[in-house]
């Protein structure tokens, strides 16, 4: 048999709006009063097992006690009414769970979407958190007929159970209800056909055109509710290695279509495409993007000739010379296809010509000491580039006109070169550079610059702390001009070793010190100056600074018959390095002097 409780708390299921006041009462039964020898003044209120302060409690009469809470904020509180039976033993009378929260806000931003092939899904913003169990019901009706309610599981969306009917307007709203209140959203009225999100286009294929290397043709399949809807498209593309997409203007794809030709593309370039669709009126939602598809534009003839230069080897006797013609492979953006070979035509001044087809990027030919004209064209399967033309003058002709004010400097981890053009119109410039070393030959790299350029950076892979010999040669229609050279560093460092000092001549009060220049491989930068430190075993150290152009220096005012320790350091812009210490002793007497 269930024991009857000694009393009750009212209300039995309290729900309180946060921040408000709340009063509960506990009513004891008459039988309980007599059995335990108590009255309402013996009641102890507790929240979560902690006694409520007496100032919140009021004894209304011998059976009833009330408790008042102000500014309720806890989401859930266990409220119990207890009695001190026989004045001392605490015994529970009744307990309730007090909940706090907010009435529902009016739902806003109600929107609906019909994902093709699925039922309609509506979403809304429920407003602030209620902290209470709140039911959201999506209601929908025609002017003449109600549809089944949609009970939301998440409180922010609901998918209706019925298939949408197109071309008939529907009214939709949301009702929100909890223990503290009930509220409805504004209703929205629409034709479900205007809320369709089509499935993505599929079977996207890309084909190129032999006639036009700047276009790719796309074709795809659209669904559009099985042809019920006319769809317009959105096409985006990018080169294979790019991360940003290029947009085909939407006005070009407004009419319903399942194919499109993308223009103004680069030849022999792989492009990636994606496409999405929407109802042609623009109402509804864009589909997700299709799977990506790629295609490569057709080849076009190379857009420019390769950079072209030559080097002359010493002549064989005086009858002819060996000339090495060199050129650079075109970058993909200019090759416009796979370069099959290069055509070199050499014409002697007497109109004798010889044609060579070369697959590499150099050709060595033997030429007499006459003037020659060399032309070079790159060929892919579509055709040949324009020709680069070089005049190779007779070795007896002295080159005139060079660039002036040649400078080189590092900036942003690049080695820049600039110059002032010569006073005669230039066809192009050739820059050559190599690492100066006493241990290895100077292996040259080179690049070509247009006639309009007078400042550029070296485009090879340069090393830090290495001395580069840079040569700039202007090239005219009649042949190369004079070459100007300088030395430069991409980045200097302190020298790898300091100078080794020695004595050239030692006198009673002076000594001539000498040293060799540090080998270029160890300099690591431009040697700006030297410091000479010298001291006796007991005296303080003296330091003198010497210009980097010197290889000897005279120390004066020395003491006779004294041991000196000398050390030299060499400095670049990035620091110095000491050489080994050297000792010498001054004689007691000058030459010819006697004790």
């Amino acid at each position: 048999q269930l024991l009857e409780p000694c009393g009750y708390i009212y209300p039995e299921f309290p729900v309180v709006q946060r921040g408000s006041n709340f009063t509960a009462i506990c009513v004891l039964k008459e039988a309980c009063l007599q059995h335990y020898y108590v009255n309402a003044s013996y009641i102890v209120w507790k929240t979560n097992h902690a006694a409520v302060p007496r100032e919140q409690v009021t004894v209304i009469n011998r059976t009833t006690s009330s408790v008042t809470f102000t500014d309720v904020v806890l989401p859930s509180v266990q409220l119990t009414c207890n009695i001190l039976s026989f004045g001392q033993i605490e015994q529970n009378v009744y307990g309730v769970t007090m909940l706090s929260g907010f009435p529902p806000d009016k739902p806003t931003n109600l929107t609906c979407i019909v994902n093709e092939g699925k039922n309609m899904l509506c979403q809304w913003d429920p407003g602030r958190e209620t902290y209470l169990e709140t039911n959201y019901t999506l209601k929908s009706e025609w002017a003449t007929e109600k549809f089944p309610d949609c009970q939301s599981k998440h409180g922010t969306s609901c998918m209706v159970s019925y298939m949408p009917t197109y071309y008939v307007n529907i009214e939709v709203w949301v009702e929100a209800e909890n223990a503290l209140g009930k509220v409805s959203s504004e209703s929205i009225n629409f034709d479900p056909v205007d809320k369709v999100k089509p499935t993505p286009p599929y079977n996207l294929s890309v084909t190129n055109s032999e006639e036009l290397s700047s276009i790719l043709k796309l074709s795809w399949v659209s669904s559009g509710l099985g042809g019920l809807l006319d769809l317009k498209s959105d096409i985006q593309y990018r080169t294979k290695d790019a991360s940003t997409w290029i947009q085909v203007p939407l006005e070009d794809t407004m009419s319903p279509r399942t194919s499109f030709t993308v223009q103004d593309l680069k030849p022999f370039t792989e492009y990636v495409f994606r496409i999405r669709s929407i109802k042609d009126s623009g109402k509804g939602y864009w589909s997700d993007w299709s799977e990506e598809a790629s295609g490569t534009t057709y080849e076009d003839r190379p857009s420019r000739p390769p950079s072209f230069w030559y080097k002359t080897n010493p002549s064989h006797g005086q009858e002819y010379r060996s000339v090495r013609l060199i050129w650079k492979a075109l970058p993909l953006s200019e090759a416009n296809g796979k370069i099959l070979d290069y055509e070199v035509i050499l014409t002697q001044s007497k109109s004798v010509s010889q044609t060579y087809t070369v697959t590499g990027t150099e050709l060595t030919v033997n030429l007499t000491n006459d003037r020659y004209v060399a032309s070079l064209a790159a060929r892919n399967k579509v055709g040949k580039s324009a020709a680069a033309v070089l005049t190779i003058p007779s070795p007896h002709v002295t080159a005139a006109y060079s660039v002036v004010n040649l400078k080189a400097f590092p900036k942003d981890n690049l080695l820049w070169v600039e110059w002032t053009p010569p006073p005669k119109p230039v066809s192009k410039y050739i820059l050559e550079w190599c690492v100066l070393s006493e241990n290895a030959p100077c292996v040259e790299d080179w690049q070509q610059e247009d006639a309009t350029v007078n400042r550029t950076h070296l485009r090879g892979r340069l090393l830090e702390s290495k001395c580069y010999q840079i040569t700039v040669t202007p090239v005219f229609a009649t042949g190369p001009g004079g070459s100007e050279s300088l030395k430069a560093y991409l980045k200097q460092a302190a020298p790898a070793r300091g100078p080794t000092v020695r004595t050239k001549k030692v006198g009673k009060n002076e000594a001539v010190l000498a040293w060799d220049q540090i080998p270029v491989d160890d300099q690591n930068g431009f040697i700006r100056n030297y410091s000479i430190s010298y001291r006796t075993s007991v005296g303080k150290e003296m330091v003198v600074h010497v210009d980097s152009s010197h290889t000897e220096y005279t120390l004066s005012s020395l003491s006779s018959d004294t041991l000196y320790m000398v050390r030299m350091a060499a400095y670049t812009d990035e620091g110095g390095k000491d050489g080994p210490e050297f000792t010498f002793t001054t004689p007691k007497f000058a030459q010819g002097e006697i004790e």
């Epitope: 006797g317 009858e319 002819y320 002697q348 007497k350 004798v352 044609t355 060579y356 033997n366 007499t368």
Partner: nanobody, 125 residues
Framework: QVQLQESGGGSVQAGGSLRLSCVIS????????MGWFRQVVGKEREGVAA????????IYADSVKGRFTISQDSSKDTVYLEMNGLKLEDTGMYYC??????????????????WGQGTQVTVSS
């Protein structure tokens, strides 16, 4: 390595004919001219005829113009010298040579880098 091998020499009566052949092998470099030269004992080697391997143009020494004809069969890497109306002064050692020099002076012997061993031609009365 490059080898030039002549053949077709021999003895012939004045007014007679001979056809010399020269096969070139091992030539990775593209030659620009193939030439025939001759040398009589005690005299300098002189140019007789040359042919451009690219365009097929020919050049002859004045002393053989109208009598000698140089031709090539590029598929066989072979050059021929057809000699008609031979004279006593045509006697000598005939050498085939290859040049890599782009030039119009195609019978200047200093411009030829590769030479055969020679084949003897003797014209008697």
């Amino acid at each position: 390595q490059v080898q030039l091998q002549e053949s077709g020499g021999g003895s012939v009566q004045a007014g007679g004919s001979l056809r010399l052949s020269c096969v070139i092998s091992g030539f990775t470099y593209r030659q620009t001219f193939m030439g025939w030269f001759r040398q009589v004992v005690g005299k300098e080697r002189e140019g007789v005829a040359a042919i451009s391997t690219g365009g097929g143009s020919t050049i002859y020494a004045d002393s053989v113009k109208g009598r000698f004809t140089i031709s090539q069969d590029s598929s066989k890497d072979t050059v021929y010298l057809e000699m008609n109306g031979l004279k006593l002064e045509d006697t000598g050692m005939y050498y085939c040579a290859a040049s890599t020099v782009i030039t119009s002076e195609s019978i200047n012997r200093n411009l030829y880098q590769y030479w055969g061993q020679g084949t003897q031609v003797t014209v008697s009365s």
